[in-house]
């Protein structure tokens, strides 16, 4: 498990509507409380089961939020990011970055409807299985001749 780790990074626009539990997720990060080393971005820390984000299904824990209603979240204090969310109103448009680990280690997450986010082993295992079946069938066929 020591080899190279590849990541597939995708961006997505997600529109959420506040409900009785708000947007249904919490955030971490900001220039004053970095969540990822050398990155002051805002990240989704937890998603509430049955909340607005969970029901939508696309936002995932660990996603980076790039903008809120078109307002960039780069280089903001945590509280400034919170204020952007507070002023965002009832319907909120999020630009988010999903980061999928595609090799060596646990499978990451991907946005729904992201066809390119398929871990490589999910392709290789069926191909290998088909090859084995074909080889076995060929050997049986040769024995009968």
């Amino acid at each position: 498990m020591n080899g190279r780790v590849d990541y597939l990074v995708t961006e997505e626009e997600i529109n959420l509507t506040r409900g009785p539990s708000g947007l249904g997720f919490n955030i971490v990060g900001g220039t004053d409380q970095q969540y990822v080393s050398n990155d002051s971005g805002i990240y989704v820390s937890r998603i509430k089961e049955n909340g607005a984000a969970a029901l939508d299904g696309r936002l995932q824990e660990g996603d980076k939020i790039l903008s809120v209603n078109g307002q960039d979240l780069k280089n903001l204090l945590h509280q400034d990011a919170v204020d952007l969310f507070r002023n965002a109103g009832y319907a909120v448009s999020l630009r988010v970055q999903h980061r999928l680990q595609v090799q060596n280690g646990p499978i990451g997450h991907r946005g729904e409807g992201d066809p390119s986010g398929i871990p490589i082993f999910m392709v290789l295992v069926p191909v290998f299985a088909l090859t084995m079946v074909a080889a076995w069938a060929f050997m049986r066929y040769r024995q009968q001749l």
């Epitope: 506040r18 009785p20 049955n50 919170v82 009832y90």
Partner: nanobody, 130 residues
């Protein structure tokens, strides 16, 4: 911990009025949302009304007859029920949701009547119209 306690139920004649109270405690946010649901014998629990700091909703069956209000100083939400009908007979429950939002804001929203939104429920108060 969050607690909800309903009171004010009772027996009333058709056309009469009652005021239900829902006393809430244990909140860490000023923006909590409270809804009223009711459950008649043998029926599903259904949404009656919802109130937040910025919006209010009513089920079609109670519009114009029921009024929801809140007293933030007392952490209490009221449901004033007028022109009561026999079909209003049910156990009335208040409910609230844990707020998960970067800003701490929450609203009822147009799908407030979904039972899945609500995390905390009171024990209920019986209303009988007969």
């Amino acid at each position: 911990d969050v607690q909800l306690v309903e009171s004010g139920g009772g027996l009333v004649q058709p056309g009469g009025s009652l005021r239900l109270s829902c006393a809430a405690s244990g909140f860490t946010s000023d923006y909590y949302v409270i809804s009223w649901f009711r459950q008649a014998p043998g029926k599903e629990r259904e949404g009656v009304s919802c109130i937040s700091s910025s919006d209010t909703y009513y089920a079609d069956s109670v519009k114009g007859r029921f009024t929801i209000s809140r007293d933030n100083a007392k952490n209490t939400v009221y449901l004033q029920m007028n022109s009561l009908k026999p079909e209003d007979t049910a156990v009335y429950y208040c409910a609230t949701a844990a707020i998960w939002d970067p800003s701490g804001l929450a609203v009822c929203g147009s799908s407030w009547y979904r039972r899945g939104w609500w995390d905390y429920w009171g024990q209920g108060t019986q209303v009988t119209v007969s």
